[in-house]
Interface confidence: low
């Protein structure tokens, strides 16, 4: 008699290993013999389909070689014309051994950056990650993390994290190991020990001493007022991560020494500096006391402030004056970049004629300082913020004895030419019709910084700045 | 190893606009400072633009302020050399260059690279 | 701007040879000089850097130096390979220029 189809064997969950067989089977009862189809995920699994094997007339499936892919609900469906088909399911769950799809790689990373070492896993049951570092295990903190995706998570870089890692992927079906990979840690030079400052006799030996540290170990370079020393002995040792340089120097003039440590990190590089003066014990003394002579300035940087054929002062305590006292000014002028242009011509012909003095010859060359006036319109009309500040500096100890390079005069202990007119000298340029400074070009709004005092007049109509000068 | 190609020359005519491409490989645009340097047919060298794109500061011959304009890609390790309002005088191969560090070190580290040059023709 | 005065702007001269080219500065200038070497059709390469540096990879043959605003390009033994046009090269904080050039022929 026809008998409908009924599932006498219901489909069961199939646990299999990747590569391995698997065998789903859907016993029926029935007569006439049913037609049996086979769905994945509900779509139809054709008989011709080179992966599978259906025997028995389509009651067993066999997966010849599973993939993780093929994970999922398999059910059968039996149909004989008699009564309504009928349907079993079973899923079939892929195990599979940790395998690290996403392995680490070496890397190089700078001190205090964030470092990820990826590990990407796949297996079933999913694999829980760990790391090794070195040949311990590797404990996490507030500062390193495993990830969930498997990644190792440094933040805030340190020194000591650099090492050897290699991550472990381990579930119920085995373990698998990453390659080792090396992670270095790069750090930016830094100067431990800055060169000191020296004030010197002319013609001694000074051993300026810089040391710096950094990953990879800076180069260390001397640059003397702007230029690589051209002069000098250099001696460099390096031990544990520190570079030591000394450079000695025979002192014939003054100048600015700075050390630059540099290191390479890839294309980029970092750099740290130091700078230290070296001054003249000799520099400072009152001019007065310096023996020296009259001489046409014959020099470039005060060119446009000092008159026309100006007999300077040079002093013979330096062993080249013109050289000295040029240098001296050049390095002035240098530091005067940054002052406003109202301030800087002004500030340029103070220290021009503070450094190269008029000369009055005689028998013996005397040379006359500026007046006082003219160094307190400087300072309170033209450079009054500049000046605040630098003296503010000096006193908070921002500034060394770099200071003395520029050699910016004490208005208090300058004559005035009201004791004698022929005492001191005028600045060329400056003129005080305080009217007129109004139109002067102010530092920030359209009035004079601060209250204008009631200064001499002098003959000229304007106060006003050379043409000479270029205010942009 | 440290190249640089120029791209972007060819035949224009005077008051035209051409844009100079210099597609840098072996270091990045953005640690170092990146010159064009022009040379007129049989004449000297003569230097056009500067740039330093980690500090964004550029600079200018008297000749070009105004009418070029120098620009970088750190994206891309290219820089470029955008020309406006060309003269017949600007006729020239058209050289990038490219020095170690910032504006204010690289005049001491020289142009120790430089590109095969590209030719710039301002004809009507 | 500083103007670069090379001379003498050609010079005739047998392998061997020791030649000097000159660049003067019209105005004080820093150690921020460097010299070139161009052949036709090429760019130029780099020789010295900061007026006496050698850049690597070039023959100690060239040497640079300076006294003032006089700045000296020397070819100790002049060979085959360095007959070609050299340039001096000036830079301030990136207000650069070149010298016209010498052309070293030879003889």
């Known amino acids: 008699l026809p008998k409908a189809p009924v599932i006498t064997t219901p489909l069961e969950t199939v646990d299999a290993l990747v590569e391995e067989v698997a065998t789903f089977m859907c016993a029926v009862e029935s007569y006439p013999q049913p037609e049996i189809s086979w769905t994945r995920n509900k779509i139809l699994i054709k008989l011709f389909d080179t992966r599978y094997s259906i025997r028995e007339n389509g009651q067993l499936l066999t997966i010849l070689s599973v993939e993780d892919s093929d994970d999922g609900i398999y059910c059968c469906t039996a149909n004989n014309g008699v009564g309504g088909a009928v349907e079993s399911c079973g899923a079939l769950q892929v195990k599979m051994k940790p395998k690290i799809t996403r392995p680490p790689i070496n890397v190089k990373i700078i001190e205090g950056l964030k470092a990820v070492l990826p590990c990407t896993t796949m297996g079933n049951p999913k694999p829980s990650v760990s790391w090794i570092k070195g040949d311990s295990p590797l404990r996490e903190n507030s500062r390193i993390a495993v990830l969930e995706s498997g990644s190792l998570r440094i933040h805030n870089v340190q020194k000591e994290d650099a090492g050897q890692y290699r991550c472990v992927a381990k579930n119920s079906l085995g373990t698998a190991y990453s390659k080792v990979v090396k992670l270095e840690v790069e750090v930016f030079a830094r100067i431990l020990r800055a060169p000191e400052s020296h004030n010197v006799t002319f013609g001694s030996f000074v051993t300026l001493h810089c040391t710096a540290t950094g990953i990879p170990v800076p180069t260390i370079t001397w640059i003397e007022n702007g230029n690589a020393v051209s002069s000098g002995s250099i001696q460099e040792s390096v031990k544990d991560r520190v570079i030591d340089s000394r450079l000695q120097l025979f002192i014939t003039k003054p100048g600015l020494y700075t050390c630059i440590a540099t290191n390479k990190h890839g294309e980029k590089f970092s750099t740290a500096k130091a700078a230290a003066t070296i001054s003249i014990a000799e520099w400072s003394k009152p001019q007065k006391d310096n023996k020296g002579y009259c001489a046409q300035y014959r020099g470039e940087v005060c060119n446009a402030v000092l008159a026309k054929d100006a007999l300077v002062f040079l002093n013979t305590s330096y062993a080249d004056p013109e050289e000295a006292q040029e240098l001296l000014v050049h390095t002035a002028w240098n530091e005067l970049k940054v002052v406003s242009p109202v301030c800087r011509p002004a500030a340029e012909a103070l220290l021009c004629n503070h450094i190269f003095q008029e000369c009055s010859p005689g028998v013996v060359p005397t040379p006359i300082p500026i007046c006082r006036e003219y160094c307190l319109a400087v300072k309170e009309l033209f450079c009054a913020k500049e000046w605040l500040v630098m003296e503010e500096k000096t006193h908070r100890g921002l500034y060394r004895s770099e200071m003395h390079l520029l050699s910016v005069p004490e208005c208090s202990k300058l004559p005035s030419m009201h004791w004698d007119p022929t005492a001191c000298a005028r600045l060329p340029h400056l003129d005080y019709n305080k009217e007129n400074l109004k139109t002067f070009p102010p530092m920030t709004s359209s009035k004079p910084s601060v209250d204008i005092p009631n200064l001499p007049s002098s003959s000229s109509s304007s106060f006003s700045v050379s043409p000479t000068y270029s205010m942009t | 190893e440290v190249q640089l190609v120029e791209s972007g020359g060819g035949l224009v005519q005077p008051g035209g606009s051409l844009r100079l491409s210099c597609a840098a490989s072996g270091f990045t645009v953005s640690s170092s400072s990146i010159h064009w340097v022009r040379q007129a047919p049989g004449k000297g060298l003569e230097w056009v633009a500067s740039i330093s794109s980690s500090y964004g500061s550029t600079s200018y011959a008297d000749s070009v302020k105004g009418r070029f304009t120098i620009s970088a890609d750190t994206s891309k390790n290219t820089a470029y050399l955008q020309m406006n309002s060309l003269r017949a005088e600007d006729t020239a191969v058209y050289y990038c260059?490219?020095?170690?560090?910032?504006?204010?070190?690289?005049?001491?580290?020289?142009?120790?690279?430089w590109g095969q040059g590209t030719l710039v023709t301002v004809s009507s | 701007d500083i103007q670069m005065t090379q001379s003498p702007s050609s010079l005739s001269a047998s392998v061997g040879d020791r030649v000097t080219i000159t660049c003067r500065a019209s105005q004080s200038v820093s150690s921020a000089v460097a010299w070139y070497q161009q052949k036709p059709g090429k760019a130029p390469k780099l020789l010295i850097y900061?007026?006496?540096s050698l850049y690597s990879g070039v023959p100690s043959r060239f040497s640079g130096s300076r006294s003032g605003t006089d700045f000296t390009l020397t070819i100790s033994s002049l060979q085959p390979e360095d007959f070609a046009t050299y340039y001096c090269q000036q830079s301030g904080v990136w207000l650069i220029t070149f010298g016209q050039g010498t052309k070293v022929e030879i003889k």
């Open positions: 260059a490219r020095s170690e560090g910032d504006r204010y070190v690289s005049g001491y580290s020289g142009f120790d690279y």
């Open positions: 900061s007026a006496s």
